[in-house]
């Protein structure tokens, strides 16, 4: 093809020419190209009008092209270009007019390009610029040059992993001249030693990220004090898991936060065994979102009912016990992957709509009722990857639930009553791998709106699937894999008119029967892989529903003998439905073991006796 | 298939091969070398990714003396405010990082362990790299 050796991803639009040892811009790519990836080619030098042949370009990726020189007007014809990526080029010479002509540029990525200063970076005319990423460079001064006043659309400025040590009042002077309240600024991984008090006074930012910046607690304390007067929608403070500098620290390090106006606050990876930190929390009582990630915190009983937090996130923290959580305004609580508190104790969160308590190894003495959470507004509940959860109430007061996930927790008392009877609004239910043994046909009664049911990795009395889905008239997805099933009721699926995907894989079925699927007019995917299917269990195999598009019978134990000829022929007739048909192999007899079923030519004659 | 040696410890010998077509060079150092009976140390990685690292996860396929364990998915980077600094690494950017590790050992039976690490990243998801680690557990220390 004319564009080779490049790869045509979308004809006439997107071409990938990555790592093809090109020394120059290819000339066999269509004029109409909008996305062009030339990364990892040794282009080394971009002269004027280098891309004259691609006037429609919108995205140009020049990552790691060993570019050392960019001349005036190198991109001059690219008036539609919105994204220019220059990551990893050892640029030594950048002409003043290098970026001229880029009248629509919105994203400029100059990461790891040997950039030593913003002052000499010739981008002042790029008025449409929304995102400037100059991370991983050699920038020492945080002085935002005068030309920034032209960049009135700038929303993201990434200066992370540079060499900035000091921030002075004059550095941010230009931000006072422009109404950039939407600017997100990332200064992470700069070795900041000093922020002049007042430098951020009356400056508004959308997001400020300061992670792994300080190698000393006193420096951190004075720098946070230096942020006084800043109004920021989201403040992210702390360290990275693989870039740890600070020793165990005390709450005084964060006292300066009281002098900021913050809407959302996130603290990550700090080894502070925070104990009585009520002063800190009181400073942040009015934020709408409060997040602690990987912070060692003994107890959070100091959270006040009156805090205005609407979203609280506690992830990978250590607690002495499950915290007392009583918060009037909270709408979302994410409490995941924490250590310490092994038993859930009820919370009082009257406004709560979203609750994720996954991956804590928690045990629940009872579940579930509005009294456990203090709310009747809950729509999303994730209790997955916990310990023993004893089902003692059928979700009284929690009738608004739409999403419920118990996977990989150990559910007790699931077959004693209709646990989900109240949940007429539930759309998604996952009880996979919950040690549930279905011994009660009413287990799913009440789930009138359910669309997705995942129950893989459980078991059934006598390994038989009874008629337990009668209420699930809206079900579209059902996963019954790894349930040790051997047989199923012929009417098990009779009410599932909307079912589209049925996973019966990894069970112990020895024969295939089409009869149970006759009432599934919407079925598109049926997976019977990894069973022990040898044959069909009746001579007259009917057709699957006409809607069926994918049938997976791989990794079964097909008996490729004359007595099963009609079944093997029936399989061949279903060829257009079969998924990975080449993995359907004979198991018996031994001389045919491993042979693909579809390539068999079984000619059988009746022996006359 | 060329084997790249990583290290030897008192109870293990570790090497890897590439299990993808690309075989983009990746440098891995472990100091001190992992002991299966339990150890802590530093894993140093030098790598130039061929796609953005954001939303990185590993698919782990572990084989113990020819017995394959179920696939395990380990999410490393979720996409914003991530745990690791390398989660923000872009295609073509040098990743030169050190990650501390520690684990309490369990009693491993002697033999050969294989661990295929499929690194998937980006949006749309594509393979970043694939490495197959061979860990020979020395019988003397079990």
């Amino acid at each position: 093809e004319s564009w080779e050796p490049c790869v045509e991803v979308v004809p006439n639009i997107t071409y990938q020419c990555m790592e093809l040892k090109f020394y120059k811009i290819p000339d066999n790519i269509p004029f109409s190209t909008k996305n062009l990836d030339l990364s990892f080619n040794p282009l080394r030098h971009l002269g004027s009008y280098s891309f004259l042949r691609f006037p429609e370009l919108q995205v140009l990726d020049l990552s790691r092209c060993e570019i050392q020189t960019i001349e005036d007007g190198a991109y001059q014809s690219l008036s539609h270009l919105s994204t220019l990526i220059l990551t990893g080029n050892p640029i030594q010479s950048l002409a003043l007019g290098a970026f001229s002509g880029l009248s629509s540029l919105q994203k400029l990525v100059a990461v790891e390009t040997n950039l030593a200063s913003l002052e000499n970076f010739p981008i002042g005319h790029l008025k449409t610029l929304k995102e400037l990423n100059v991370a991983h460079n050699l920038i020492q001064s945080f002085k935002l040059p005068e030309y920034f006043s032209n960049l009135t659309n700038l929303e993201h400025l990434d200066l992370s992993s540079n060499k900035i040590q000091n921030i002075y009042c004059k550095d941010l002077q230009v931000l006072h001249q422009m109404p950039l309240s939407n600017l997100s600024l990332d200064l992470s991984l700069n070795p900041i030693n000093f922020i002049q008090p007042g430098a951020f006074k009356e400056i508004r930012l959308h997001k400020l990220t300061l992670r792994s910046n300080f190698d000393d607690l006193n420096v951190m304390k004075t720098c946070i004090q230096g942020l006084a007067g800043l109004e920021v929608h989201r403040l992210v403070l702390g360290e990275f898991r693989n870039e740890r500098n600070l020793e165990e620290f005390d709450k005084s390090s964060l006292e300066g936060l009281c002098n900021l106006t913050i809407e959302e606050f996130r603290l990550t990876y700090l080894d502070c065994y925070l104990d009585n930190i009520i002063d800190l929390f009181n400073c942040l009582a009015n934020v709408s979102s409060f997040s602690l990630v990987s912070v060692n915190i003994k107890r959070v009983e100091d959270f006040s009912y009156n805090f205005r937090w609407q979203h609280l996130e506690l992830v990978n923290c250590k607690f002495e016990q499950f915290p007392t959580l009583e918060l009037k305004s909270l709408k979302r609580l994410t409490f995941t992957a924490n250590k310490g508190g092994n038993a859930f104790s009820e919370v009082d969160l009257p406004s709560l709509e979203f609750l994720d308590l996954s991956r804590n190894g928690l045990s629940f003495k009872g579940c579930c009722s509005q009294s456990d959470f203090g709310t009747t507004s809950l729509k999303y509940l994730d209790l997955s990857f916990n310990d023993v959860i004893t089902m003692s109430s059928n979700f009284l007061g929690l009738e608004q639930l739409e999403h419920l996930d118990f996977q990989h927790s150990n559910l007790k008392q699931m077959s004693q009553f209709s646990v989900f009877l109240s949940l007429r609004n539930l759309i998604y239910l996952d009880i996979s791998h919950t040690h549930t043994r279905v011994a009660f046909n009413g287990i799913f009664d009440g789930l009138l709106s359910l669309k997705v049911l995942k129950m893989a990795g459980n078991s059934f009395q006598e390994n038989f699937l009874p008629d337990i889905f009668t209420d699930l008239k809206n079900l579209t997805f059902l996963d019954l894999s790894q349930c040790q099933l051997e047989q199923l009721s012929p009417t098990a699926f009779d009410t599932l008119n909307k079912l589209q995907v049925l996973n019966m894989s990894h069970n112990n079925f020895f024969s295939l029967d089409t009869f149970p699927y006759k009432c599934l007019p919407s079925l598109q995917v049926l997976d019977y892989s990894l069973n022990h299917i040898m044959t069909s269990n009746n001579q007259e195999l009917q057709h699957f529903p006409s809607s069926l598009a994918f049938l997976n019978l791989t990794q079964n134990d097909f008996a490729c003998t004359c007595e099963h000829q009609s079944f093997l022929q029936w399989i061949k007739d279903q060829r257009q439905l079969l998924v990975e048909a080449e993995r359907m192999e004979c198991a018996t007899p031994s001389d045919k073991q491993g042979m693909p079923v579809l390539s068999l030519n079984i000619t059988c004659q009746m022996n006359k006796t | 298939q060329k084997h790249y040696w990583v290290c030897n410890s008192s109870d293990a010998s570790i090497s890897y091969t590439y299990c993808d077509k690309m075989q983009y060079p990746i440098s891995i150092n472990v100091n001190p070398c992992i002991k299966l009976k339990g150890s802590r140390g530093l894993l140093h990685i030098f790598y130039i990714p061929r796609r953005d690292v954001k939303q990185l996860y590993f698919n782990l396929y572990i084989t113990v003396n020819s017995m394959t364990l179920p696939k395990r998915k380990e999410v490393i980077c979720r996409g914003s405010d991530d745990d690791y600094s390398f989660c923000r690494a872009l295609k073509g950017e040098t990743v030169n990082t050190t990650v501390s590790f520690s684990f309490k050992g369990i009693k491993f039976s002697k033999g050969k362990y294989k661990c295929v690490v499929e690194a998937i990243s980006g949006s749309p998801e594509e393979m970043l790299f694939c490495l197959e680690f061979d860990i020979i557990h020395q019988p003397n220390s079990n």
Epitope: N276, I278, E301, D302, F303, S304, Y305, N306, T324, E326, K328, E346, V347, D348, L349, P350, K365, G366, C367, S369, Q370, S371, D372, F373, G374, T375, T390, S392, S393, L396, G397 | -
Partner: antibody
Framework: QVQLQESGPGLVKPSDTLSLTCAVS?????????WHWIRQPPGKGLEWMGY???????DFNPSLKTRITISRDTSKNQFSLKLSSVTAVDTAVYYC???????????WGQGTLVTVSS | EIVLTQSPDFQSVTPKEKVTITCRAS??????LHWYQQKPDQSPKLLIK???HAISGVPSRFSGSGSGTDFTLTINSLEAEDAATYYC?????????FGGGTKVEIK
Amino acid sequence: QVQLQESGPGLVKPSDTLSLTCAVSGYSITGGYSWHWIRQPPGKGLEWMGYIHYSGYTDFNPSLKTRITISRDTSKNQFSLKLSSVTAVDTAVYYCARKDSGKNFPYWGQGTLVTVSS
Amino acid sequence: EIVLTQSPDFQSVTPKEKVTITCRASQSISDHLHWYQQKPDQSPKLLIKYASHAISGVPSRFSGSGSGTDFTLTINSLEAEDAATYYCQQGHSFPLTFGGGTKVEIK
């Protein structure tokens, strides 16, 4: 509307076991919440004794742990208190109450006086 | 266990006067403190939860404040029907405990 009603003997001999029952109407005791016993000696303050959770789990005040039992009869929607080896200091008005999700008590029975005397 | 100390034990007040009752906790309990009113021969009635949140149906003259260890219940303009004993209760941790009570009588 949730209502609680205590019942049981008003007089118990020293060293005997005090037994009280709380009948609940308007809410199932297995449907949610925890169900508590609180007592008040004549002319004195309130003392929390213990509870039974809707799941059947129980917990008690450490000061009474060796003598107290709380159980329930779900078919009658009631829960009971047993306090063994009583003495005169156990003379009190005994209240049953329902605790809210926050650790407070919006619903109380009217109380029943139990006198320990020979 | 957390000890709650109420003061005064007794208060004699004329109608329309302002009444202030304090409750001090032996350790910080944030705002996990609740107030009850108990009239003679009646069971206690929840008035205020979480230090300052009035229960619906409770007259607006009742208010609460405080956080940490020091809390106050205020009756702004005492009425005859307010003659009762008032108890504070901490909900910070088990065992749940009550203050000793403050008896308010009308002069």
